[in-house]
């Protein structure tokens, strides 16, 4: 017999998801309206294109990047889309409530959709560490908690540390990575005997994961530049991100070959390492004054990514139960930290010229900002992990981990895969 979706989840998921959707619709009805002042249609189209790039990154890029499991590729792509769709809706409301609510109504602009898509992207990065071990009802909980935590983190950082949209959103890499890792730590870890093959990658899904990586690679400059204020900043961000990801591709492929005894290239290393440069330059992409610096960063990031992919999976698998191919979490945590360190170095150099005697204070502020992001990520991640362990969600049994058939109808399959 093909595995059935547990009866209780069959009742629980549609009820839970549709009730939530109805609540969101009501919130939109009572509290939101569109920005009525669209004077320049050309500007509108240009602005929409940035949002479109972000949606492509989220839906296709991250959707397919996480689809490399032999028996969990359908679920990876579709669950990602589900989380993106839900996450964007909640993020628009949350951002509006946190930033605009004194006026009584949340004004929806293309910019708020852009912000919301980036917030939802955080969930898609985190979920890489738990996909295959959770059902959709659990993922709904994860979306709600993570988007709420990130939204509040951004507001606190904005108000306390006086940072702009770009700076407080660029903590997303570190935040998403640590959130995902702490959720994974709470979930049942060992794969029972006889199911080890399910978390292995297969050729066709691996190809689709590479397609996801390519989409992310193409659109990463849009992600890093989306929240920057002036045209010159956006131009610098696009150029520097492009140089960094270009070098990290070369480094990833050659470094992967170097890391293998027979000089072979690992698909898993490449999927993740091609993006390394984009993550590492994220925080300071608009500030890097010349291409060679961005390229050096891309090189270092590529090497860290390949090194991490070679040596960290064993530890992550034992401690966190994360399969070898889900390396986005620790990859982004290392590269996000690298990006933050680079920014702190720039800050030290800058503070010398911007009023004497403030270097220590500025560095302290920046470290405080980063620490706050990590602490909130870990705490909200642990809270989410504990919530996901509740019996009411009817989590898949460990024997059904990484199995599309638990969730999908395959008419042509009478028995297993």
């Amino acid at each position: 017999m093909s595995s059935k979706y547990p009866r209780s989840v069959r009742r629980c998921l549609p009820l839970w998801a549709l009730t939530l959707e109805a609540a969101l619709i009501l919130l939109f009805y009572f509290f939101t309206h569109y920005d009525a002042s669209l004077e320049d249609q050309k500007g509108l189209v240009a602005s929409y294109q940035v949002g479109q790039d972000l949606t492509v990154m989220a839906a296709i890029g991250l959707g397919f990047l996480t689809s490399s499991f032999r028996r969990h590729s359908w679920s990876s792509v579709a669950f990602n889309l589900f989380m993106l769709a839900l996450g964007v809706q909640w993020a628009i409301l949350l951002d509006g409530f946190l930033s605009q609510f004194p006026s009584g109504k949340v004004v929806i602009t293309l910019f708020s959709i852009r912000l919301a898509t980036m917030s939802a992207l955080s969930v898609l990065i985190s979920v890489d560490a738990v996909l295959g071990k959770v059902n959709l009802a659990q993922l709904v909980v994860m979306v709600l908690v993570e988007v709420t935590a990130l939204g509040n983190l951004r507001m606190v950082i904005s108000n306390i540390f006086n940072t702009d949209y770009h700076m407080n959103m660029m903590h997303i890499y570190v935040f998403a990575a640590y959130f995902g890792l702490s959720v994974a730590w709470c979930l049942p870890k060992p794969l029972p005997e006889g199911t080890e093959d399910k978390d292995q990658t297969a050729t066709i899904p691996s190809l689709s994961a590479m397609l996801g990586a390519l989409f992310l690679w193409m659109f990463w400059p849009s992600f890093n530049s989306a929240l920057l204020r002036s045209p010159i900043e956006r131009k610098n961000a696009v150029f520097n991100t492009y140089y960094a990801v270009a070098v990290s591709v070369v480094t990833a492929i050659s470094g992967s070959s170097l890391a293998h005894p027979q000089g072979k290239i690992s698909k898993t290393y490449v999927h993740s390492a091609v993006l390394a440069g984009g993550v590492a330059v994220g925080t300071s992409c608009h500030l890097i004054p010349s291409p060679w610096l961005a390229m050096v960063l891309g090189l270092v990031a590529g090497l860290i990514s390949v090194g991490g992919a070679k040596y960290l999976p064993g530890c992550c698998n034992r401690v966190l139960g994360i399969p070898h191919s889900s390396i986005m979490g620790y990859n982004f945590s290392l590269l996000g930290l690298l990006g933050e360190i680079i920014y702190i170095v720039l800050l030290v150099l800058d503070t010398v010229g911007a009023g004497n005697g403030m270097i220590g204070f500025q560095v302290l502020l920046s470290i405080g900002e980063l620490s706050l992001a990590i602490v909130i990520a870990l705490m909200s991640g642990l809270l989410t992990g504990l919530l996901l362990n509740l019996k009411i969600w009817k989590a898949p049994h460990e024997a059904k981990y990484f199995d599309d058939q638990v969730f999908w109808k395959f008419p042509h399959l009478a028995v297993g895969f």
Partner: antibody, heavy 125, light 108 residues
């Protein structure tokens, strides 16, 4: 010559509406963020609203949120401030100003480098 | 909140200093900008990036910043310097400048 010229001010009753316009000349408007700043009689300067160069993002001081809307039409070199539900404390001279971005090592720094002559708005019954 | 003294005065030829102070997050890490507002005219940028003068601004005006306080110095005071002077760091959270209360300079 770089210039900003505001228009649309006047006398209006409390609860009424006005639309201020600002026309830019001597530079490419689409490359700059724009702002409205006001000065009430006998008071200091108060920042009111901004709009990004591409119109994608806007921000307002708390006291005007939900009542004022900033917009721009780059093809016409125009920036607007739609003011609804006007109150007596909105009486001021309203200035349109251009935002300049200056590259620093760890951040871009912004300031208002070009200002218009201002247009007077009086809210009175 | 950015604080300035409400008034300052001096005689022609004298040197006058106007101070500006604020919180760590607003002034500590940010550059300070100074604007001159003559009666009935638009504000004019006087000093940017703590101590830089735009072209066309007299070298009698100079700015400085240390920690969370900044100051504008006017040397060789003239009657045409009689105006309101505003200190305005940029607030990244707000997305615009935070103007100090302004200092009314009187040339006696």
């Amino acid at each position: 010559q770089v210039k900003l010229l505001e228009s649309g001010g006047g006398v209006v009753q409390p609860g009424g509406s006005l639309r201020l316009s600002c026309v830019a000349s001597g530079f490419t408007l689409r490359s700059y963020g724009m702002h409205w700043v006001r000065q009430a009689p006998g008071k200091g300067l108060e920042w009111v609203a901004f709009i990004w160069f591409d119109g994608s993002n806007k921000g307002y001081v708390d006291s005007v949120k939900g009542r004022f809307t900033i917009s721009r039409d780059n093809s016409k070199n125009m920036v607007y401030l739609q003011m609804n539900s006007l109150r007596a404390d909105d009486t001021a001279v309203y200035y349109c100003a251009r935002e300049k971005a200056l590259r620093g090592i760890s951040r871009y720094n912004y300031y208002l480098d070009v200002w218009g002559k201002g247009t007077t708005v009086t809210v009175s019954s | 909140v950015v604080t300035q003294p409400p008034s300052a005065s001096g005689t022609p030829g004298q040197r006058v200093t106007i101070s500006c102070s604020g919180s760590n997050s607003i002034l500590g890490s940010k550059y300070v900008y100074w604007y001159q507002k003559l009666p009935g005219t638009a504000p004019k940028l006087l000093i940017y990036k703590n101590d830089q003068r735009p072209s066309g601004v007299s070298d009698r005006f100079s700015g400085s910043k240390s920690g969370t306080s900044a100051s504008l110095a006017i040397s060789g005071l003239r009657s045409e310097d009689e105006a309101d002077y505003y200190c305005a760091p940029w607030d990244a959270n707000l997305g615009g400048p935070v103007f100090g209360g302004g200092t009314k300079l009187t040339v006696l």
